[in-house]
Each structure stands twice: as structure tokens, then as C-alpha cells.
């Protein structure tokens, strides 16, 4: 789990499909600070 101040964690039910792929729920990438703007 990401516990730095720059991480936005998303513990949302159904995020992973049964196949292990990511469901396209338009959630925000977890590590905001590693991305420029």
C-alpha cells in the first residue's frame, strides 16, 4: 500500500475484474507526485 503524502489510495470494491485486469472506472492514478503537470 502506498503511504506517502503524494499517494491517493483507492480501495474501491470491484476495481479488479475476475480475470485480474483493471476495470475502467476512471480512477485517478495512485502516485500524483510522480506525474508532471
Amino acid at each position: 500500500a502506498c503511504d506517502t503524502a503524494t499517494c491517493v489510495t483507492h480501495r474501491l470494491a470491484g476495481l479488479l475484474s475476475r480475470s485480474g485486469g483493471v476495470v475502467k472506472n476512471n480512477f485517478v492514478p495512485t502516485n500524483v507526485g510522480s506525474k508532471a503537470f
Epitope: 485517478v28 492514478p29 510522480s34 503537470f37
Partner: antibody, heavy 115, light 108 residues
Amino acid sequence: EVQLQQSGPELVKPGASVKMSCKASGYTFTSSVMHWVKQKPGQGLEWIGYINPYNDGTKYNEKFKGKATLTSDKSSSTAYMELSSLTSEDSAVYYCAKGGNDGYWGQGTTLTVSS
Amino acid sequence: EIVLTQSPTTMAASPGEKITITCSASSSISSIYLHWYQQKPGFSPKVLIYRASNLASGVPARFSGSGSGTSYSLTIGTMEAEDVATYYCQQGSTIPFTFGSGTKLEIK
């Protein structure tokens, strides 16, 4: 084409509040955070904070807590920043910027605080 | 907060010259959190380099970035007139995110 369209220039009196907008288009609004950055005339860049439009979560620079309030409206793909108790120190250009390495910034909103 | 100190503050270079701008952080940061921006007079900033060494889309290959820990640099391989601008480093390792104070690049 991704675009961030910011609201027009504001001239307000000391002590008042102002709410500026940043309308996003060309991408899924809830898929990226929206940052806000301050630039005083002839000076450098200062990060105010960001909002996650997916869940309205916010992170602020401590310096701007109580000064800036970030909100968003998913239905119109618009991010807002309200600045309160304005003083001359708040006179600046304020930018919104999409998080995500692709470098999309609004054109800036010029705020002038003067009596 | 993490303070980013840029050097030099201002500089003038001739066309074709190689330019290096440095960014020193007050605390060590991972390179994935260090980004560079260019701002031309009267325009919004734009990202040049993200995660210390990755060239942003549409940025000419004469720009490059490197570094680790507390020391990072932006290099322009051959200065061109269109590179006249102010350059900022920025860290996303710790909130508040912070920018360097800027390096103003002029042409001789």
C-alpha cells in the same frame, strides 16, 4: 484535443472573495487530478493544491489552507478555486493544470486585488 | 518542505551553445518525482522533462535531463533562439509540491 479553459480576469476589492473556473475538455475529467498554481507578477511558480474530481479529494499547500478552496463539478467537467479574504498579496495569475505528464495548462486567470 | 535551489538564476548563451541548469534539493528525492518546465514570456508553463529524464511529448530532442538524490540537471544540447524562457524544476515527492525559483535563459 485536451483543453483547459479558464475564466476571465477579475478585479476585486480587498476583503472580498472570488471564484474562478477551469473547464476541461478532450479527456475524461475524472481520470486525472487538477492542480492549481499561483504566479505573482514577475515571480516564480507556487503550488496551491490539487483536487481529484473522481471523489472530490483534495490536497493543499498548508500556506493556502483557509485561503483557497478547491471544488469540481463532474457534470460540466469544471474545476473551481475560490479565494477568500483577499489582499494585495493575492494579486497574481492563477493556473489550472492537468496532472499526468502530458503538460496541459490553462491560459491563466489574472486576479487583481485593489480598492 | 523541500526547497529546490536552481543555478544559475539568469544566463545568456549564444546560438549553438550547450546549456546546463542545475537543481539542488534540500532533501533527497527519488528521480520519479523531479520534473522540469519551460515558461516563455506571456505564456503558461509547459512540461519539458518528467521523472528527471523523460522527454515530454513534442519537446525537441536537444533537451535532456538527468540526476538523482539531491542533484538534478537540465541540458540543452545546442541553444536556439526559441529556447529563450524561464526554466523551473519541480518536486512531487512531498506535499507541498514545490518549484525551484527559476532560471532565466537569454540569448547573446
